[in-house]
Amino acid sequence: SERCDDWGLDTMRQIQVFEDEPARIKCPLFEHFLKFNYSTAHSAGLTLIWYWTRQDRDLEEPINFRLPENRISKEKDVLWFRPTLLNDTGNYTCMLRNTTYCSKVAFPLEVVQKDSCFNSPMKLPVHKLYIEYGIQRITCPNVDGYFPSSVKPTITWYMGCYKIQNFNNVIPEGMNLSFLIAFISNNGNYTCVVTYPENGRTFHLTRTLTVKVVGSPKNAVPPVIHSPNDHVVYEKEPGEELLIPCTVYFSFLMDSRNEVWWTIDGKKPDDIPIDVTINESISHSRTEDETRTQILSIKKVTSEDLKRSYVCHARSAKGEVAKAATVKQKVPAPRYTVELACGFGAT
């Protein structure tokens, strides 16, 4: 067979689906690799071919589209399972070709089992809700295209193991779940199960997501530098180790990049000819406010180093702040035998 542009195994698309549920999987060629869509390809006389490699096998085989009740079918650029079976797990390849052109890509499909409380090896999307912010909604994800708009599915929402009913602040509203006001206690896994009929059969779609309640933008402030501050003086003798922590609190801000850095005499530590190391640690509150600590360390400080300016800087989407550390050379305590005696006029 002639050459084929092989995009390899697209591990970015690690598709996970539940056993015994419908799954519709679009050929990734048109979404990520080619600059034209399926309709254009089809009208240009290109054919889309599917095949697969079973889990723990090397042999590529055609997909059996003649199973009872059309369990596996293809529609345009979509591969359909109605429903999946555990042994459908494997690497699937879609190939677009005619006599002069060929392009293909493979992707892994994993069929997973869930337990009675919807726990599974499935990687869960995280949805962030602002604490005490007013009405916010989550929507049952990835259910588009499974049934026509004329079909009215039933949707049941669960928190963990339990149907959501008679909750004070959480109300199921069809495909949406409304949080009248979100609290830390609303953290957890939420599952929607969509049930719909098709050709005399009933199908179910289970979708679980993790809700994380985070700090509200109403309460967000610019970065706050707790250390260094005006109450602490770093007094060292030459030869001692100088350790200065820069501790900064950042309010949670969606998609904000929090940055902390030191300058020494207005320059980055890397641009100064001294042996300085900086260690960073990060901790988070329950609402994902962040505290970053960067410890500036000079193992054996010189008297020159003790004259320098050490400034901690911090930046977030809310603003930029800076604070200088007060660094001094320790004045040696007087030695009695010489200095004190001289002071008393001894000869």
Epitope: L86, D115, S116, T154, T156, Q165, T202, H204
Partner: antibody, heavy 117, light 107 residues
């Protein structure tokens, strides 16, 4: 298509036990609840309990707690209901009913258990 | 346990009639209500789930409605094959409980 085939009718003595089987096919046995419901002659339906074969999680009606045991064998896709300390009022048709969620979508044909001395 | 009360316990209607069966719960069940049909000597069959969701393959003459504690099953045009006993069942709170049943006959 979903099929639930139950074991045959049983005649039991008071104080003994009965074990009814329900063999499932046409769906993923591990991923659905298997319920057990009974119906005394000429009476209504009474839910006894359910099991999730995937993890063995069970829920029982208080009335049957301690007297009924639900089990499932994933290798043969078979669910079992064992009822002990039988009395005459346990004479009934016992049904298994499969449900992906809580509704019982599909039912077995029923097993008549007669308790008589 | 939640008590389910069905009425009437039996009814007789003519072919083509509109038939209504009601089911009342002892407390709110948030639409978590199923309707089953049981023909003589047969196992029950699911007709409607979650108050109004028609189970696959069930004729559209069957419909369900209601909220809170009160629910209704309607057969818009009674057919001879609809002769059966109909049960409501709540699945809001364990244990699941059934109504006493409504026997539907043809006049």
């Amino acid at each position: 298509q979903v099929q639930l085939v139950q074991s045959g009718a049983e005649v039991k003595k008071p104080g003994s036990s009965v074990k009814v089987s329900c063999k499932a096919s046409g769906y993923a046995f591990s991923s659905s609840w298997m319920n057990w419901v009974r119906q005394a002659p000429g009476q209504g339906l009474e839910w006894m309990g359910r099991i999730y074969p995937g993890d063995g999680n069970t829920h029982y009606a208080q009335k049957f707690q301690g007297r009924v045991t639900l089990t499932a064998d994933k290798s043969t896709s078979t669910a079992y209901m064992e009822l002990s300390s039988l009395r005459s009022e346990d004479t009934a048709v016992y049904y298994c009913g499969e449900g992906y969620l809580d509704p019982m979508d599909y039912w077995g044909q029923g097993t008549l258990v007669t308790v008589s001395s | 346990d939640i008590q389910m009360t069905q009425s009437p316990s039996s009814l007789s209607a003519s072919v083509g009639d509109r038939v209504t069966i009601t089911c009342s719960a002892s407390q709110g069940i948030n639409n978590y209500l199923n309707w089953y049909q049981q023909k003589p000597g047969k196992a029950p069959k699911l007709l409607i789930h979650y108050t109004s969701g028609l189970h696959a393959g069930v004729p559209s003459r069957f419909s369900g409605s209601g909220s809170g504690t009160d629910y209704t099953l309607t057969i818009s045009s009674l057919q001879p094959e609809d002769v059966a006993t109909y049960y409501c069942q709540q699945y809001s709170i364990l244990p699941w409980t059934f109504g006493g049943g409504t026997k539907v006959e043809i006049k």
